[in-house]
Interface confidence: medium
């Protein structure tokens, strides 16, 4: 009976040993899987974070596009209305022009002599920009940056004159110190008869032949109203 008990005990020990080994293997396996799951979770978390960030950026970008689209749509619907009508009013700014305070502005990216720039604007049924306030000065300055740019002001026939007839004497001025000086020392012949924005926005008179950038301006008609979106 004793030997039988010992046999059973050995059997139980073996079974228990197998069970322990098996359990250890399972625990080891679970632990590995757990590590994998942890890693997978981390990976999924970072992917989710990235997707959220991308989505947020896409959303911002989409908002900008929608804003631009609405603006373009308004502009196009206005132009369609203008083209379908028979009046001679300019009710909205043409494509590629910037509207500000009931005027339309176009900013060149190339250079021309003052007379050619003046001609270019007039061929758009517009004129070189006429600056009538500090607010308009800031607006133009913001768009042109630190680049020499012609405006619609000259004294080629004697006194300083704005191209649209705005009174120079009583109007807004933003000359650099010591300017205008009608300097003859440049060696190009004659003085300096045309005004331009300098790199800091303040004005200087220069030789009219210099190929500077320029800004065209045309006024929207007083009676016009913004059309509803279609």
């Amino acid at each position: 009976q004793n030997s039988q008990l010992q046999e059973e005990l050995r059997g139980l020990r073996e079974t228990f040993s197998n069970f322990t080994a098996s359990t250890e293997a399972q625990v080891k396996g679970l632990s590995t899987q757990g590590g994998n799951v942890g890693r997978k979770m981390k990976s999924l978390e970072s992917q989710l974070e990235k997707q959220q960030k991308d989505l947020s950026e896409d959303h911002s970008s989409l908002l900008l596009h929608v804003k631009q689209f609405v603006s373009d749509l308004r502009s196009l619907s206005c132009q369609m209305a203008a083209l379908q009508g028979n009046g001679s009013e300019r009710t909205c700014c043409p494509v590629n022009w910037v509207e500000h305070e009931r005027s339309c502005y176009w900013f060149s990216r190339s250079g021309k002599a003052w007379a050619d720039a003046d001609n270019y604007c007039r061929l758009e049924d517009a004129h070189l920009v006429v600056v009538t306030s500090w607010e308009e000065q800031k607006f133009v300055q913001h768009h042109i940056g630190p680049v020499n740019t012609w405006m619609g002001l000259h004294d080629q026939n004697g006194p300083w004159k704005w191209v649209d007839g705005t009174d120079y004497e009583t109007g807004f001025k933003n000359w650099r110190p010591e300017q205008p000086d009608d300097w003859y020392g440049h060696g190009l012949g004659g003085g300096e008869d045309c005004a331009h924005f300098t790199d800091d926005g303040r004005w200087n008179d220069d030789v009219c032949q210099r190929p500077y950038r320029w800004v065209c301006e045309t006024e929207l008609d007083k009676a016009s109203q913004e059309p509803p979106l279609l």
Epitope: N96, W97, L123, D125
Partner: antibody, heavy 122, light 107 residues
């Protein structure tokens, strides 16, 4: 449909004047510039001038300055080109053309009239 | 004034040929150039505007290239109806000068 229809052929004496008309239809007349271009027999195209009917602002080629007058009648959507002190060298086909409206970008003449033959002969 | 030099002044070619016409300008006009086709007794017809843009209804065998001072009109495969005179024109301020023209004839 955009159309520019010009007046008929003219025979003129040297020293006189001629007035050619160009009636526009199918678009808003005041929204586009109207240009005038001429072509002498067997020769190339020569730009004469432009008018903006919206503002009545005009531009003329130096060669014709003082001899050409371009006008526009908004009520009838018609542009006119008058050339004075005619000489035999003015014998040509005169075209009106609409300047395509791409503000702040390149221009182009997208629609042309059929042409008006002006003969200057004594 | 801006000077336009169009070349060649005349050109003989056959149906199916590839043809190139050039226009050289005396100063930088950026992309402010148009090309026209004119047939005898007819008004000119716009082909290309802003140097490279195909006008409405113009076959895709016509193409424009160049900017600044050198421009090219190319017809990739000549068709019988393409035999005509071609003109370039600048729009870099007045006067809006035309090139002298290129007469394209059947060989």
């Amino acid at each position: 449909e955009v159309q520019l229809v010009q007046s008929g052929a003219e025979v003129k004496k040297p020293g006189s004047s001629v007035k050619v008309s160009c009636k526009a239809s199918g678009y808003t007349f005041t929204a586009y510039g109207i240009n005038w271009v001429r072509q002498a027999p067997g020769q190339g195209l020569e730009w004469m001038g432009e008018i903006f009917p919206r503002s009545d602002q005009t531009f003329y080629a130096q060669k014709f300055q003082g001899r050409v007058t371009i006008t526009a009648d908004k009520s009838t959507s018609t542009a006119y080109m008058e050339l004075s002190s005619l000489r035999s060298e003015d014998t040509a086909v005169y075209y009106c053309a609409r300047k395509g409206r791409e503000y702040g970008t390149s221009h182009y003449f997208d629609y042309w009239g059929q042409g008006t033959t002006v003969t200057v002969s004594s | 004034d801006i000077q336009m030099t169009q070349s060649p002044s005349s050109l003989s070619a056959s149906v199916g040929d590839r043809v190139t016409i050039t226009c050289r300008i005396s100063e930088n006009i950026y992309s402010n150039l148009a090309w026209y086709q004119q047939k005898p007794g007819k008004a000119p017809k716009l082909l290309i505007y802003a140097a490279i843009n195909l006008a409405e209804g113009v076959p895709s065998r016509f193409s424009g290239s160049g900017s600044g001072t050198d421009f090219t009109l190319t017809i990739s495969s000549l068709q019988p109806e393409d035999f005509a005179t071609y003109y370039c024109q600048h729009f870099w301020g007045t006067p809006f000068t035309f090139g002298q023209g290129t007469k394209l004839e059947i060989k």
